[in-house]
């Protein structure tokens, strides 16, 4: 093995390099010194490094490592952040249009219901948006609330428009009757199934993307340990102490050091792989009733069908509701 | 069937986008994302190698630094000697991940569990969802024709499913991404604190 070239007799090269790292030359020895106080770049002979320089090298090494890590994840981070934003906005657009479709259906088919229907539809789709963004709302409750709110209006405006004002305190009964009489048939259940499935999947999809960002951010901003800092310093900077400015670390040595420094980070690998494969599986299943775009944009039609169902059974319903929502049966049996 | 509310979009931008020839649905966008993400599936296991390849490492030189001395690039000492009597690498590995990494691993485990439970079971015929989820016998009254059958997924083929192109604030064209593979920064553009 060839002997190392003799260190720069005046430490001049080392000084000029170090000046770029740390303006102010007072830390670099004029000439090589024994370096007995060094803890990382342990000298085999005279050295151009001081304890202060060593500390600066360690700091720089850890900083380099952090920057390398950030540049490594830049494209991945960009990909996920960008997509999370795109999908969130796209989902909001879908919700907005689904609301517009539904309002338009009411305006064109049931103009007498519109003022109140618009309000209930608006509240429903607001809840849909909040649910997608992670709000603690129950989808079945949202759908029930929509139909509970719509039915009294349908009953008083479409089925029984001549109802005297004195009878209008039956709204609460009508809300209850809506469920007990299964006024809308099985449409509410159908909508619950489709909306809850599609929204759950949409919500978990967004949650997963946001967690992806969190994972990258976490590993992006890792602070490396002192031990790692020492290993990196030895690999990248200790050669300078001997005046070996142009020498680069051995490849195998670099891999060993990096595996040591990144042992913790690499533990994420198994779960990261599983994350991507699980996300792929989820995405592959996001169609038909698991696709919120398909479900929400078709809601107006299902709601329309449900109102037609009520109208079809209006005669029988009106009779039953007349009994159930009477303040007392005894009025009828006197 | 319900009057289709095509002319009543409050957001006029949709009308502009709705008939674009090379339409892009949300589902195709999702699949595209997954394909891109899959190219990063080995991201974490490849990190050590990636960082070595993006920091100064002897490639064409005969001699390299092993942490203690100059050695020939292919000698055993190239990897081994530098570690001797210095730091116990095994100990460093044994310390286990930092608390923040452990936390993020726990979160990943949790989301993976959720993703698995939410995934549609393979082989499930979704076309039959009305039979599975829909009108139960007895719910439609005695007269069977009270049951409305036209409300399943079949009817949900909305004429123009939402397309989102120009109206999205973000454009995910590959050209916008800084590099289209995992090499985020070119090698000759090393981080400024390396002075080689």
């Amino acid at each position: 093995q060839p002997p190392p070239p003799p260190p720069d007799a005046t430490c001049h090269q080392v000084r000029s390099f170090f000046q770029r790292l740390q303006p102010g030359l007072k830390w670099v020895p004029e000439t090589p010194v024994p370096g007995s106080d060094l803890q990382v770049c342990l000298p085999k002979g005279p050295t151009c490094c001081s304890r202060k320089m060593e500390e600066k090298y360690q700091l720089t090494a850890r900083l380099n490592m952090e920057q390398l890590l950030q540049s490594a994840s830049m494209e991945l981070k960009f990909l996920i952040i960008q997509n999370a934003a795109v999908f969130q906005e796209a989902f909001e657009i879908v919700v907005r249009h689904a609301k517009n479709y539904t309002n338009a259906m009411f305006k064109n088919n049931y103009p007498s219901l519109t003022p109140q229907a618009f309000e209930f539809v608006g509240e429903f789709f607001t809840d849909v948006s909040l649910y997608i963004l992670g709000s603690d709302i129950n989808v079945d409750d949202m759908v029930n609330e929509l139909f509970d709110s719509l039915f009294p209006v349908i009953y008083t405006q479409l089925m029984n428009p001549g109802l005297p004002d004195s009878a209008l305190d039956i709204n609460e009964c009508l809300r209850g009757a809506r469920r007990d009489l299964k006024v809308f048939g099985n449409f509410p259940k159908l909508i619950m199934t489709q909306v809850s499935k599609s929204l759950q999947v949409t919500r978990i999809f967004l949650q997963a993307l946001n967690l992806g960002i969190e994972v990258i951010n976490t590993t992006d901003h890792l602070k490396f340990s002192k031990d790692c800092g020492r290993m990196l310093t030895r690999m990248w900077y200790c050669s300078y102490c001997q005046g070996l400015m142009m020498v680069k670390p051995c490849g195998g040595y670099c891999n060993v050091v990096m595996q040591g420094c990144m042992a913790g980070v690499v533990e994420i690998d198994k779960y990261w792989r599983e994350y991507i494969l699980s996300l792929e599986e989820l995405v592959n299943g996001m169609y038909r009733i698991y696709d919120m775009e398909n479900v929400l944009l078709g809601l107006f039609s299902t709601i329309h069908d449900s109102i037609q169902y009520v109208q079809k059974n209006a005669g029988k319903l009106t009779t039953t509701i007349g009994k159930l929502c009477a303040h007392s049966q005894q009025r009828q049996y006197r | 069937s319900a009057y289709y509310p095509e002319d009543l979009f409050i957001d006029k931008k949709v009308l502009k986008v709705a008939h674009v020839e090379h339409e892009e649905t949300l589902s195709s966008r999702r699949r595209e994302l997954i394909q891109k993400l899959k190219s990063f599936i080995s991201f974490y296991s490849a990190l050590p190698g990636y960082i070595c390849s993006h920091s100064p490492v002897a490639e064409n030189d005969t001699l390299c630094w092993n942490g203690q001395e100059l050695v020939e690039r292919y000698s055993q000492k190239a990897a081994r000697n530098g570690m001797k009597n210095q730091f116990n690498l095994h100990e460093l590995k044994m310390k286990g991940p930092e608390p923040v990494v452990s936390q993020i691993i726990d979160k990943l485990k949790h989301i993976n569990q959720l993703l698995r439970t939410m995934s549609v079971p393979k082989g499930r015929v979704l076309d039959k969802n009305l039979d599975e989820e829909g009108f139960e016998s007895g719910d439609c009254g005695d007269d069977e024709d009270e049951c409305i059958g036209g409300s399943g997924d079949g009817m949900m083929k909305v004429k123009n499913q939402l397309r989102f192109l120009a109206e999205l604030a973000y454009d995910l064209d590959v050209d916008d991404v800084p590099g289209n593979n995992q090499q985020a920064t070119p090698k000759d553009n090393e981080i400024s604190t390396f002075h080689n």
Partner: antibody
Framework: QVQLKQSGAELVRPGASVKLSCKAS????????INWVKQRPGQGLEWIAR????????YYNEKFKGKATLTAEKSSSTAYMQFSSLTSEDSAVYFC??????????WGQGTSVTVSS | QIVLTQSPAIMSASLGERVTMTCTAS???????LHWYQQKPGSSPKLWIY???NLASGVPARFSGSGSGTSYSLTISSMEAEDAATYYC?????????FGGGTKLEIK
């Protein structure tokens, strides 16, 4: 005229179950709610649950969930309440009452349940 | 749950006397859902006054009911022997539906 006829008195062992019946006549059974109310000796009234026989929808007092199960048989215009895991606390008279959305108008004569070993 | 408190728990009145009993709810109850039942020993309760002020079928006109919000009352303008019984107020508004503890009316 509206009548609710309840099954006869029951003497049951602790831990056992009992199924009480309430047969309705004089009105359309599926059009009104059937409620069940408990009255312990010398005490007040306590609402247990109600069922809408037309759809089978049930509503329970949280206190009796898991204890009482309501069913209705349209063909015989009969409502049932199954009471399970009986203890001495369940010794009481149980009434069925038919109601609109607002009012319990008509009551059965009551069924006395005695839980004793 | 809505707690209904009846007072007095027991009262006695002479024949021909005016009688008033009250029912106080722990939170507001709509008058449409506040009712009174009469129960005599060994019998089932009978609907007596419904929706605060309406007399059930067969109830004598000497009975009346009033109130709103959290305060309701049942009044007998002139006590008669057949009126001796326990009277329960009841809210059928918010589940769990509840009854007051009862006012036992005796003849003095």
């Amino acid at each position: 005229q509206v009548q609710l006829k309840q099954s006869g008195a029951e003497l049951v062992r602790p831990g056992a179950s009992v199924k009480l019946s309430c047969k309705a006549s004089g009105y359309t059974f599926t059009d009104y709610y059937i409620n069940w109310v408990k009255q312990r000796p010398g005490q007040g009234l306590e609402w247990i649950a109600r069922i809408y026989p037309g759809s089978g929808n049930t509503y329970y007092n949280e206190k009796f969930k898991g204890k009482a199960t309501l069913t209705a048989e349209k063909s015989s215009s009969t409502a049932y309440m199954q009471f399970s895991s009986l203890t001495s606390e369940d010794s009481a008279v149980y009434f069925c009452a038919c109601s609109t959305y607002y009012t319990m108008d008509y009551w059965g004569q009551g069924t006395s349940v005695t839980v004793s070993s | 749950q809505i707690v209904l408190t009846q007072s007095p728990a027991i009262m006695s009145a002479s024949l021909g006397e005016r009688v008033t009993m009250t029912c106080t709810a722990s939170s507001g109850v709509s008058s449409s859902y506040l009712h009174w039942y009469q129960q005599k020993p060994g019998s089932s309760p009978k609907l007596w006054i419904y929706t605060t002020s309406n007399l059930a079928s067969g109830v004598p006109a000497r009975f009346s009911g009033s109130g709103s919000g959290t305060s309701y009352s049942l009044t007998i303008s002139s006590m008669e022997a057949e009126d001796a019984a326990t009277y329960y107020c009841h809210q059928y508004h918010r589940s769990p539906y509840t009854f007051g503890g009862g006012t036992k009316l005796e003849i003095k």
